[in-house]
């Protein structure tokens, strides 16, 4: 099993531009989670889906952030417009 697959691995963008992160969860997993990690703020849960439905998006109250899961094998996290403080490592995770 390839595990959770994210793309891109690295992203550099200018402030104000749109950024889209993609995730392919492990096949058969019905829950998907997006996290953000920075030195200053630690690990933050942004949103999680269960059976493609967003259950809790309270980790991303800024409407610059949006996430979708159109089907069981794909999710996107979009930032529009991006800001310097969005610089972070973004993790996608999945579970049964």
């Amino acid at each position: 099993d390839a595990g959770v697959i994210q793309s891109p691995r690295h992203e550099v963008t200018e402030m104000g531009q749109e950024v889209t992160l993609r995730c392919k969860p492990i096949s058969g997993h019905n829950s998907l989670f997006w996290y953000r990690q920075t030195m200053m703020r630690g690990l933050e849960l942004l949103i999680y889906f269960n059976n493609n439905v967003p259950i809790d998006d309270s980790g991303m109250p800024e409407d610059r952030f949006s996430a979708k899961m159109p089907n069981a094998s794909f999710s996107t996290l979009k930032i529009q417009p991006s800001e310097p403080r969005d610089s972070a490592v973004y993790f996608c995770a999945s579970s049964l």
């Epitope: 259950i55 309270s58 980790g59 109250p61 800024e62 409407d63």
Partner: antibody, heavy 117, light 106 residues
Amino acid sequence: EVQLVESGGGLVQPGGSLRLSCAASGFTFSNTGMHWVRQAPGKGLEWVSYISSGSSTIYYADTLKGRFTISRDNSKNTLYLQMNSLRAEDTAVYYCARRGEGAMDYWGQGTTVTVSS
Amino acid sequence: DNQLTQSPSFLSASVGDRVTITCRASSSVNYIYWYQQKPGKAPKLLIYYTSNLAPGVPSRFSGSGSGNEYTLTISSLQPEDFATYYCQQFTSSPFTFGQGTKLEIK
């Protein structure tokens, strides 16, 4: 029916501390983000702080960072605001509000904080 | 911080009038949200995501706009609409409010 009930307000001297509480009912508190907003007498609304469902994401108004601390206890369905080093300009009605529709869709009735010697 | 400026700050109007309140942002925002507050009461959400009416809000209220400029329109004022209205942005923390528009009976 969604209900938010604030408590803990009162009269406090400058430099003092106060902890506000907001008891929530009628919705799944444990997966809902929550805000504090305040309103000084005769003034407009001022956003204070936000906390996500699991407390991993927290934001504060720049002017209040370091003095105010937002927290929550999901087992008690309660939101808190710890306010330290209080100043006269912190005198206001403090509201808790639920995050919903991308905004604040339900509000409590407010609790009054007066900072005066 | 993104500063929101509402105009006018005060507005006198009569029952049946059509009124428009403007909210201008110092930096572009994705959406604007509108609240109504009556004296001694908590604010009430009117419009979310720029143009969506919150549950129970009459259809005489509408919202529009994009970028830096947004509007709240009341098509035919009713006695219960006399209140103070606030805009707010959630595009970027801190989640600033406009200074408010007080709508009074002429």
